[in-house]
């Protein structure tokens, strides 16, 4: 008698290793004999597909060499025209030993930045990934974490993070090891001991001492009044990544001496600077009551920044105020070459107006300081990152006390526009027509940035401005 098909052995989940054989059995009782078709993920498997073998009147489906992509739901459908078609489904789970698909590579990273060593894996069950540093398993902590992807992330890289690393991928079927890679930590040039300022008699010998460190070990050059040192002898020694340089001078004129430590990171250089003044005791004769005088600015560095024919205050505590103040600006100006294009024009305006203050002539010529609000705008909006670095240098004593004009002004100590509109000077317009910006950069990092930061852009303003904040 005709009998509708019945599947007597329903399909079950089959586990198979890659490159092995996997077989699904779909035993059917019926009369007449049924037609049996197979699907994978609801797509019909063709009888002539050479990756499969279909035998026993279609009741056995064999995958001849399992691939990772064979994972899925397999169904057999039996139909003999009597009653309805019947179906049974089962899953194929492809098991796979761990395999490292993206191994880690050698990394050179600057101290304080974030390092990521990749380690992307395949396998089923999903392999767990751990890391070995040197010969020991690597412990995770607040800085060091193994990401979901298996990659190793190290925040705020430290010198002690340097070394040899490998990743290990493990599951129930086996273990895979990556090749050993090297993490090299480079460190910005940093001055450990800055040269000290001296007030000496004419014809004295003075030794200026400058010590710096960094990875690679930096080189030290000396600058005298903005130019390479023309006289004097330099002695250098290097020990434990610390370079020690001594400049011996025969003093015949006052000067500003700068120690510059430089090291290379790929194509980029990092520099650290510290300056000292050499003054000659008899040269400086400030008048008792009068600390300076008003004169038209005749220098070069601040030409583009100060108003034409600006009346500036020249400080007579310097032997040659015009030259000394111009030197201060020149030295500080060179520092600004490394800051971002957003910060530089604002910082230049602040610097020139800070060192060559507007002068109020009268019986006692008086310097007019910058208005507090303008100082804050430069500090917090245009140069937030750079200001932190400058303040850090000032606190660490990399700017000597005699060099107080080189350190950044303390905005809070400057007079406000609200007190007396004539008591403080406004900076020229700070409009550089860059991108639209609307939010402040987070003011947390005190490390110098190698690259100019990407400032956030906004869409809700109808004009272009440059800093990370502009008006209210």
């Amino acid at each position: 008698l005709p009998k509708a098909p019945v599947i007597t052995t329903p399909l079950e989940t089959v586990d198979a290793l890659v490159e092995e054989v996997a077989t699904f059995m779909c035993a059917v009782e019926s009369y007449p004999q049924p037609e049996i078709s197979w699907t994978r993920n609801k797509i019909l498997i063709k009888l002539f597909d050479t990756r499969y073998s279909i035998r026993e009147n279609g009741q056995l489906l064999t995958i001849l060499s399992v691939e990772d992509s064979d994972d899925g739901i397999y169904c057999c459908t039996a139909n003999n025209g009597v009653g309805g078609a019947v179906e049974s489904c089962g899953a194929l789970q492809v098991k796979m030993k761990p395999k490292i698909t993206r191994p880690p590579i050698n990394v050179k990273i600057i101290e304080g930045l974030k390092a990521v060593l990749p380690c992307t894996t395949m396998g089923n069950p999903k392999p767990s990934v751990s890391w070995i540093k040197g010969d020991s398993p690597l412990r995770e902590n607040s800085r060091i974490a193994v990401l979901e992807s298996g990659s190793l992330r190290i925040h705020n890289v430290q010198k002690e993070d340097a070394g040899q690393y490998r990743c290990v991928a493990k599951n129930s079927l086996g273990t895979a090891y990556s090749k050993v890679v090297k993490l090299e930590v480079e460190v910005f040039a940093r001055i450990l001991r800055a040269p000290e300022s001296h007030n000496v008699t004419f014809g004295s010998f003075v030794t200026l001492h400058c010590t710096a460190t960094g990875i690679p070990v930096p080189t030290i050059t000396w600058i005298e009044n903005g130019n390479a040192v023309s006289s004097g002898s330099i002695q250098e020694s290097v020990k434990d990544r610390v370079i020690d340089s001594r400049l011996q001078l025969f003093i015949t004129k006052p000067g500003l001496y700068t120690c510059i430590a430089t090291n290379k990171h790929g194509e980029k250089f990092s520099t650290a600077k510290a300056a000292a003044t050499i003054s000659i005791a008899e040269w400086s004769k400030p008048q008792k009551d009068n600390k300076g005088y008003c004169a038209q600015y005749r220098g070069e560095v601040c030409n583009a920044v100060l108003a034409k024919d600006a009346l500036v205050f020249l400080n007579t505590s310097y032997a040659d105020p015009e030259e000394a103040q111009e030197l201060l600006v020149h030295t500080a100006w060179n520092e600004l070459k490394v800051v971002s294009p957003v910060c530089r024009p604002a910082a230049e305006a602040l610097l020139c107006n800070h060192i060559f203050q507007e002068c109020s002539p009268g019986v006692v010529p008086t310097p007019i300081p910058i208005c507090r609000e303008y100082c804050l705008a430069v500090k917090e909006l245009f140069c937030a990152k750079e200001w932190l670095v400058m303040e850090e240098k000032t606190h660490r004593g990399l700017y000597r006390s005699e060099m107080h004009l080189l350190s950044v002004p303390e905005c809070s100590k400057l007079p406000s526009m609200h007190w007396d509109p004539t008591a403080c000077a406004r900076l020229p317009h700070l409009d550089y027509n860059k991108e639209n910006l609307k939010t402040f950069p987070p003011m947390t990092s005190s490390k110098p940035s190698v690259d100019i930061p990407n400032l956030p852009s906004s869409s809700s303003s109808s004009f272009s401005v440059s800093p990370t904040y502009s008006m209210t």
Epitope: L376, E380, M417, K438, P442, S458, V465, Y469, M471, T472
Partner: antibody
């Protein structure tokens, strides 16, 4: 003495237009930033728009963008707020206020002088 | 956009009390924060600018301070004329945000 006087408020139907004026004296509009701030009945302060004449730069709150236009006539020392496509939710007292300095520093000086306000009622 | 969350929304205090009102910025901001006093039917008055600078003519019992993203207005000894609504205000890039206001009432 610094003074700001608003005018131009009144009753207008939804979809209608109004132009508010803010006449300044005791300082020059060109050297300051001018702002419009509104206050719906029984509610808090809400910034509407700002202009810095020295730059010809303007900015608007999202709620009014595309409908309101802020401008200034430095020869008349007056700022304006052109309000189009008015809605019931624009009903408020509109204040004009100034802050010292250009757009970068005015945030640090605060809105130091305010007008007495002008009432705008949008209702059918 | 930066939000300024002001707390409390209202408070009751007596003459002579020390009163503290706080504004918390939703993200890192500059010190371009001001505080205003507003009385019913009147325009707001500037009290504090640049987070901590006292505006000219404002009594010294008012002071402002900053700690990270928290800005505080303190009235050291409340006077009868100080009962009003106080607002903080932050200036972003051409974007001004006010706090919701704090109403200081007589206990």
């Amino acid at each position: 003495e610094v003074q700001l006087v608003e005018s131009g408020g009144g009753l207008v139907q939804p979809g209608g237009s109004l132009r508010l004026s803010c006449a300044a004296s005791g300082f020059t509009v060109s050297s300051s930033s001018i702002h419009w701030v509104r206050q719906a009945p029984g509610k808090g302060l809400e910034w509407v728009a700002s202009i810095s004449s020295s730059y010809g730069s303007t900015s608007y709150a999202d709620s009014v963008k595309g409908r309101f236009t802020i401008s200034a006539d430095t020869s008349k020392n007056t700022a304006y707020l052109q309000m189009n496509s008015l809605r019931a939710e624009d009903t408020a007292v509109y204040y004009c206020a100034r802050s010292e300095g250009d757009r970068y520093v005015s945030g640090y000086s605060g809105l130091d002088y305010w007008g007495q306000g002008t009432l705008v009622t949008v209702s059918s | 956009d930066i939000q300024m969350t002001q707390s409390p929304s209202s408070l009751s205090a007596s003459v002579g009390d020390r009163v503290t009102i706080t504004c918390r910025a939703s993200q890192s901001v500059s010190s371009a924060v001001a505080w205003y006093q507003q009385k019913p039917g009147k325009a707001p008055k500037l009290l504090i600018y640049s987070a901590s600078s006292l505006y000219s003519g404002v009594p010294s019992r008012f002071s402002g301070s900053r700690s990270g993203t928290d800005f505080t207005l303190t009235i050291s000894s409340l006077q009868p004329e100080d009962f009003a609504t106080y607002y903080c205000q932050q200036s972003g890039v051409w974007l001004i945000t006010f706090g919701q206001g704090t109403k200081v009432e007589i206990k």
